[in-house]
Interface confidence: low
């Protein structure tokens, strides 16, 4: 089961090498646990494997397996990172017919400094 409003250790292998090691679910796309998020991430692996952007893996992990700090703050990916990745990878997204989730549309995300990210309280819905 999923612990209510507490950070949990990352178990998705692809994201275990990120600079953060705790996450929170559900994520922006409503995936309620890491196993579902991992399966959904598989659709995006052509982008990561072909390295369409140097930031692709960071973005995918921050989106699907978001950073969680101090138990109550979930950190979504920043808009600038999203825009960079989407711009870099647009051609491949089209080539592979990858559906970009509307929850990850860049204009829904906030501008923030990647080193000091905007956080949101998981008790409320994140609207960007």
């Amino acid at each position: 089961g999923h612990s209510l409003f507490t950070c949990e250790p990352i178990t998705v292998p692809r994201c275990m090498k990120m600079a953060y090691n705790m996450t929170f679910f559900p994520n922006l796309m409503g995936h309620y646990d890491q196993s579902i998020a991992a399966v959904e991430m598989e659709h995006f692996l052509p982008l990561a494997n072909l390295e369409c952007s140097p930031n692709i893996e960071t973005f995918l992990c921050k989106a699907f397996v978001p950073t969680c700090i101090e138990q109550i703050h979930v950190v979504p990916p920043c808009r600038k990172l999203c825009e960079k990745v989407y711009s870099d990878c647009k051609k491949l997204i089209d080539t592979f017919g990858i559906r970009w989730p509307e929850e990850l549309e860049c204009d829904r995300l906030q501008y923030c400094d990647e080193t000091v990210p905007v956080t949101f309280d998981p008790h409320t819905e994140f609207l960007g």
Epitope: P13, K17, L45, A48, N49, L50, E51, P54, D88
Partner: antibody, heavy 119, light 107 residues
Amino acid sequence: QVQLVQSGAEVKKPGASVKVSCKASGDTFSNYVISWVRQAPGQGLEWMGRISAYNGYKSYAQNFQGRVTMTRDTSTSTVYMELSSLRSEDTAVYYCARSSGYVGWFDPWGQGTLVTVSS
Amino acid sequence: DIQMTQSPSSLSASVGDRVTITCRASQSISSYLNWYQQKPGKAPKLLIYAASSLQSGVPSRFSGSGSGTDFTLTISSLQPEDFATYYCQQSYSTPLTFGGGTKVEIK
């Protein structure tokens, strides 16, 4: 099936440069990430860096930074590795190999190119 | 950089023997570990990827296990064509690094 064919053996003098080619076939060229790995005589394997055929994005191992340049030619589905300021310790077999991703495993490998550095 | 340490560096075995080679990473690499076989004068050949997945076309006598820092390559029944050098490689982070190799020789 996917195949990587490398250029032939080279003999170079210390201080010179060498450029090794690796021609890919069997899949869309943009679907390749090519790594270069070298092996000195009787020694183990050493990763030098990689290049994405899709967008030319590269990453070099620190040991080779400043001396290695990896490029691609999409018109001929060929990747190149140039190593400059050669020294005797650079005598090795140089392999290109397809990476499963920008980090990953290597399969298949080219047949190898022996580069001998000798005065 | 992540250091990969293989042991033993060489071993002697007979056809039919069960052979085990170990590889240790200097830090946790999850299951980002691959195994290769190399014969003299030839390029390495991928045997196992992601710690335990058998590469297509590789005989089932080869198997891999482990996670974190400790990994094992096992050949369940050594065949004449298996005498070669075996390398592990981590694909957790760049620079990608290899173990020093294990040479499997005929006893």
